[in-house]
Structure formats: structure tokens, C-alpha cells
Amino acid sequence: MMTGTIETTGNISAEKGGSIILQCHLSSTTAQVTQVNWEQQDQLLAICNADLGWHISPSFKDRVAPGPGLGLTLQSLTVNDTGEYFCIYHTYPDGTYTGRIFLEVLESSVAEHGARFQIP
């Protein structure tokens, strides 16, 4: 039975040209995290394998930095980066847990972080 929950940074906003940290946290389970995949709609951004380190997709390599931790830093943001991002936790023996973050990239300086929320 999957008992874990994913806590994410929720709905967040950031300024065009700036950077943002995407983070998720898996709690309420003793399952071992084997890797975390970061995806944007149908695109793979990066994979962090707990033992083997990071894979950064070539199309994002100049704008994505691994970390902190299992998180992902997006740099040089453009309005086109607005959208849904998913952290997919591969765990043993539970299976996969998915968290969702919505990022809005703003032209002006009114960007501010939304509240954290949980996805069961």
C-alpha cells in the first residue's frame, strides 16, 4: 500500500530572466527513493538517481542546474517556461509518486511564491 505524500512548492511565480528552484519532498513512507525524474508536460528535464547522480536533458543543459538536493534549479526563465512541472519519485517497494508544480513566469517584478501544498 502506498502511504506516502509529496509536498511541493505548489503554485509559484518568478520573473522573466530570473531563476527558480523546483522542489518536492516525499514523506509518510519508509520506501527507498531510487530516483526522481523532473518533467515538464511531455518533456524530460532531468533525472536524479540517488546513487548514480544526475542526467540533464541536452535541450535544457544550459538552463537547468541540479539541486539543491533532489530539486532542480531553472535559470534564465522565459515566458515560455510557464506551465506544469512534475517531480516523479521512483521508490522501492512502493512504486511511483508524482508531485505537481505550476510555474508562472511574469514580465514584471510582481512575482512571488505561492503556498506549499500536498498531493497524496
Epitope: N37, D51, G53, I56, S57, P66
Partner: antibody, heavy 119, light 107 residues
Framework: QVQLVQSGAEVKKPGASVKVSCKAS????????MHWVRQAPGQRLEWIGG????????SYNQQFKGRATLTVDTSASTAYMELSSLRSEDTAVYYC????????????WGQGTTVTVSS | DIQMTQSPSSLSASVGDRVTITCKAS??????LAWYQQKPGKAPKLLIY???YRYTGVPSRFSGSGSGTDFTFTISSLQPEDIATYYC?????????FGGGTKLEIK
């Protein structure tokens, strides 16, 4: 240039163990994970597992967990793969191969080590 | 585990032909897919990474495409030195898995 040089062919009896070495040169050994892949005669490639020389972290194919042990000697830039409780189905060519920097594709391969298990 | 199914398993073509090999994953692997060439008695060589990126030094006649579960590897104009077995490899999640291979022969 990057080179991965493996130890020579081995002939083992069922139930025995084998330890294959892979000496790396031409790059900073701790910056790339090292993997082991085997190929039985006429069969597809099969990933055994990988090791991160930077911290010793290992990821195994569950099919080999408990029988395969991956280790590194960073001072000698050498990776090792030990396979125990050998059976005839383990007869194969064993390759060490490194994953690219910040990528998981396998960009350099050793020449392969033939392990024959026969009574 | 993610199963990788390659087709065809063998293929005979003439020099200059356009050759296409397909690889189907049993589940979505995004673009976490590579293609390798293996000649008899030799270790595999990386040709394509992240589904469509040509590795350093690989001739432009080799290309890859696809995303998700369906991938294609193409040789635009077959050369005699391309005779080999070609494998796809997914690294979306462990255990990493390979296709069964496509053995390419000259007619």
C-alpha cells in the same frame, strides 16, 4: 584519450566467483559513473548495475542484486565487478562502460572480458 | 522493468539505401533513449543520445527521432562499414534495459 582496459578472460566452475577489473585513464575517474553490462552469446545487452566513484553509491539490476558486487579503487582509477554463485547462464562477455558527464548514455566501453562457466 | 522491442531483428539492404530501425518501449521513457552500434567481437559504440542527438564524431548519415514509447533510428545512405548490430537503450528508470538488437547486412 579516454580508455577503459579490462582484465583477461576467465574460466570458472559453477558455484565459483569471478572478479573482473576495469582500469580507466584519460579522464577524471570520479566524475563519471561506471556501469557493467553483459552479453551472453547471441543475446541482448543486459545492464548489471552502476557505481558512482565519487561516493561509492551503487545501483543494481534486481536480477543481480546479492550476486553482483560493484566496487572502485579511486586511487588506482579502477572499477571492479564481482559475480558470485556462478552458473552456466552467466557465460557471457562482461563490459565496463562509463556514463557521460551529467548524462546517462554510455559513451566509452572497455574491450570486454569473456567469462566462461563450465564444469 | 521497461521492455524495449526492436524491429526488425535483422535487415538486408544495399549500399546507398535508407535504413530505418524502430524501438518501442513498454512505457513512456520521454527522450531517455540511446542507440549503439556493435560490430562482431567488439564493444558497442554510442551513436545517438537523448533520442535525437548525434554523438561526437558520428557521421551525419546516422539520426534518431521519437519520444515517449516510439523511437526511430535511421541511416540515410547505407555504407559498407555500417554492417553491424544496432541496439536501443532506455535510461529513464533503473534497471536500464536494451532492445534485442537489429542485425544489419548488405544485400
Amino acid at each position: 584519450q579516454v580508455q577503459l582496459v579490462q582484465s583477461g578472460a576467465e574460466v570458472k566452475k559453477p558455484g565459483a566467483s569471478v572478479k573482473v577489473s576495469c582500469k580507466a585513464s584519460g579522464y577524471t575517474f570520479t566524475e563519471n559513473a561506471m556501469h557493467w553490462v553483459r552479453q551472453a552469446p547471441g543475446q541482448r545487452l543486459e545492464w548489471i548495475g552502476g557505481i558512482n566513484p565519487n561516493n561509492g553509491g551503487t545501483s543494481y539490476n534486481q536480477q543481480f542484486k546479492g550476486r553482483a558486487t560493484l566496487t572502485v579503487d579511486t586511487s588506482a582509477s579502477t572499477a571492479y565487478m564481482e559475480l558470485s554463485s556462478l552458473r552456466s547462464e552467466d557465460t557471457a562477455v562482461y563490459y565496463c562502460t562509463r556514463s557521460s558527464y551529467y548524462r546517462y548514455d554510455l559513451d566509452y566501453w572497455g574491450q570486454g572480458t569473456t567469462v566462461t562457466v563450465s564444469s | 522493468d521497461i521492455q524495449m522491442t526492436q524491429s526488425p531483428s535483422s535487415l538486408s539492404a544495399s549500399v546507398g539505401d535508407r535504413v530505418t530501425i524502430t524501438c518501442k518501449a513498454s512505457q513512456d521513457v520521454k527522450t531517455a533513449l540511446a542507440w549503439y552500434q556493435q560490430k562482431p567481437g567488439k564493444a558497442p559504440k554510442l551513436l545517438i543520445y537523448s533520442a535525437s542527438y548525434r554523438y561526437t564524431g558520428v557521421p551525419s548519415r546516422f539520426s534518431g527521432s521519437g519520444s515517449g514509447t516510439d523511437f526511430t533510428f535511421t541511416i540515410s545512405s547505407l555504407q559498407p562499414e555500417d554492417i553491424a548490430t544496432y541496439y536501443c537503450h532506455q535510461h529513464y528508470t533503473t534497471p536500464w534495459t536494451f532492445g534485442g538488437g537489429t542485425k544489419l547486412e548488405i544485400k
